[in-house]
């Protein structure tokens, strides 16, 4: 009896794993084996496919074959018993085009109200993605184990932190990789669950801001309690995309180690030009807070984007605010040669309820104020360039009383 050649051959490539699956043509014939040959583009001869010779099952793995993943190859299969079937040729394919991105590896670290997610490619030193390793972006789905309501987070890098979670709560998540340059979306990782910790008695420092004074950077933050010590760490921002890099390590700012105030001052030459991440941690000697939210700090912008200077003209029901160029040390105005947008925050002196105005103009009216009432105002500048999305720190607050009624003209 003539053996029929196998049919419906499928090539599955996930990362560097090359798997072939096929259907037997004749289930009634026992003890049949299968063998594959492959042929590279531009070659006439067929070569035995190692790992896929005399296979008794309907699946084989040819991952050990060192192929150029960008080069088209052709496969053929036949069945063998005493005699052999005719060859069945599989449509030619390019491994890279066919390949799927495998599930990434995920490591989670729990805080009380946050989870730190470390993601790395599932296949270390992958040949398939050797040229694209740094282009991976990731997306994840996270849910509270108790509710199952999913939240999706797109376009994250190898390290991501999710804030504003509840203490002592189990969260589950799964992550997949994407290579947007090649229009490839990967396979989800297994589900990872982690329980956030009990609430830390020491909250993380908040509202971290960097400003420039003379030749120094001044880093300030807010903290709930007194008699604390703080430490500040920095990281090159670009490393967030590549924690595999041996430089990926948060480092201490020497002048900000064990400081007893909610600010520290360090020379500008501590940082070369670049974009950095900064974080702060508090300690009372026994306990330690979790790390603060990270702030992005661009030395280029920081040196120039100073808080605006403004004057207030008070009326009974409004303020007119005139914004001028910020002053450097020596009282000389700073020339800022990129367009700015101004954020003005104002509030009644006796209240915490803040209101916000965003304006491109340098003369701004704050309307709907009450007569004979003290209002406070602070302002900051933002760059309008999308690529250079930077902000100054807020100016010091200026408080003024509105005039008595009927003076709005």
């Amino acid at each position: 009896k003539n053996l029929k050649s196998p049919q419906k051959v499928e090539v599955d490539i996930i990362d560097d794993n090359f798997i072939l699956r096929w259907n037997r043509s004749d289930e009634s014939v026992g003890n049949v084996t299968f063998s594959f040959d492959y042929q590279k583009t531009g070659m006439d001869n067929w070569i035995k496919l190692s790992g896929c010779q005399n296979i008794t099952s309907t699946k084989c793995n040819f991952s050990s074959l060192k192929l150029n993943v960008y080069e088209e190859i052709k496969l053929r299969i036949r069945a063998e018993k005493e005699n052999t079937s005719s060859w069945y040729e599989v449509d030619s394919f390019t491994p890279f085009r066919k390949a799927q991105i495998g599930p990434p590896e995920v490591h989670l670290e729990a805080e009380d109200k946050a989870i730190v997610i470390h993601i790395s490619p599932g296949t270390k030193d992958s040949v398939m993605w050797a040229l694209d390793g740094l282009s991976f972006t990731y997306s994840l789905v996270i849910w509270k184990n108790s509710s199952g309501v999913e939240e999706r987070i797109e376009n994250i890098y190898s390290r991501h932190k999710i804030y504003k979670l509840s203490p002592e709560t189990t969260y589950c998540l799964k992550v997949k990789a994407a290579l947007l340059t090649s229009w490839k979306i990967g396979v989800y990782s297994p589900v990872h669950c982690i329980k956030t910790t009990v609430e830390n008695e020491l909250p993380p420092p908040e509202n971290i801001e960097v400003s420039v004074q003379n030749q120094n950077y001044v880093l300030k933050w807010d903290y709930t309690y007194a008699n604390m010590t703080f430490q500040v760490q920095w990281l090159h921002a670009f490393l967030k995309r590549n924690p595999g890099n041996h430089l990926y390590k948060w480092k201490q700012i020497p002048d900000c180690e064990n400081v007893k105030t909610t600010q520290c001052v360090f020379p500008q030459n501590v940082f070369q030009k670049g974009i950095y991440l900064l974080r702060v941690q508090a300690s009372d000697g026994n306990n330690t807070s979790f790390w603060s939210e990270e702030i992005k700090f661009d030395t280029e912008i920081q040196a120039f984007l100073l808080p605006p200077v403004f004057n207030i003209r008070s009326l009974s029901d409004s303020f007119h605010i005139y914004i001028g160029a910020p002053k450097q040390s020596g009282n000389t105005p700073v020339i800022q040669d990129y367009p700015l947008i101004y954020e003005i925050i104002f509030w009644e002196n006796t209240s915490n309820a803040e209101r916000k105005i965003i304006e491109k103009k340098t003369d701004v009216t704050v309307p709907n104020l009450k007569p004979l009432t003290v209002y406070c105002v602070k302002a900051r500048a933002h760059t309008m360039d999308e690529k250079l999305n930077k902000s100054s720190v807020f100016s010091d607050a200026v408080c003024e009383k509105t005039k008595p009624g009927n003076t709005s003209k």
Epitope: E109, E111, V198, N200, Y248, K249, N287, W291
Partner: antibody
């Protein structure tokens, strides 16, 4: 697979120093903290300190700051602990143990351990 | 330094028993707790990390629980190969500190 290889035993005279080695393989040596732990006969475990093999940053248990020096040789993926001015109190098994990834925000558990080097201080 | 206190230094147990070993820290350690199993003449072996995550290679009869300052290692049905000394260790604050160990002995 991850392996940490340590020599079995060292006999040292009182007052002399000793340098113990820990040869790491099966992982990227510079990506993980390397820790050292002491266990005296019939006693519990004491953490000595840890070193970042990529830049040799060290953290010590204050108790061992004057006793131990931690170093690495990246080319041979080997970590070392040098113990100075040994006394009979320093007789113990010294373990190296891999810690968390250096890129982690917080410390992690010691997941792989060497078999330990037994140091005997005797004249 | 954070002090780690293990409930008892030794336990006399029967095979098949449910065993519970407790570990208390002097400060909150936010689940940064590991359990190690050590057999005579061998290095400690990481059994549980993050207070609850069982390391691969260990059977599911082992489990870890707890939070804040109080943590527990449980063995549902003790087998002969589980007879060892168990240590807890905190890795929240440096210096990392270990409990004094709990030795399981068969009755």
């Amino acid at each position: 697979q991850v392996q940490l290889q340590q020599p079995g035993a060292e006999l040292v005279k009182p007052g002399a120093p000793v340098k113990l080695s820990c040869k790491a393989s099966g992982y990227t040596f510079t990506s993980y903290w390397m820790n050292w732990v002491r266990q005296r006969p019939g006693r519990g475990l004491e953490w000595i300190g840890k070193i970042d093999p990529s830049d040799s940053e060290t953290h010590f248990n204050q108790k061992f700051r004057d006793k131990a020096t931690l170093t690495v040789d990246k080319s041979s993926t080997t970590a070392y602990i040098q113990l100075s001015s040994l006394t009979s109190e320093d007789s113990a098994v010294y373990y190296c143990a891999r810690g968390g990834r250096i890129s982690f925000d917080y410390d992690a558990a010691l997941d792989y351990w060497g078999q330990g080097t037994s140091v005997t201080v005797s004249s | 330094d954070i002090l780690m206190t293990q409930s008892s230094s030794s336990f006399s147990v029967s095979l098949g028993d449910r065993v519970t070993i407790t570990c208390k820290s002097s400060e909150v350690i936010y689940n940064r707790l590991a359990w190690f199993q050590q057999k005579p003449g061998n290095a400690p072996r990481l059994l549980i990390s993050g207070a609850t995550t069982l390391e691969s290679g260990f059977p599911s009869r082992f489990s870890g629980s707890g939070s804040g300052k109080d943590y527990t290692l449980s063995i549902t049905s003790l087998q002969i190969e589980d007879v060892s000394t168990y240590y807890c260790q905190q890795y929240w604050n440096k210096p990392f500190t270990f409990g004094s160990g709990t030795k399981l002995e068969v009755k």
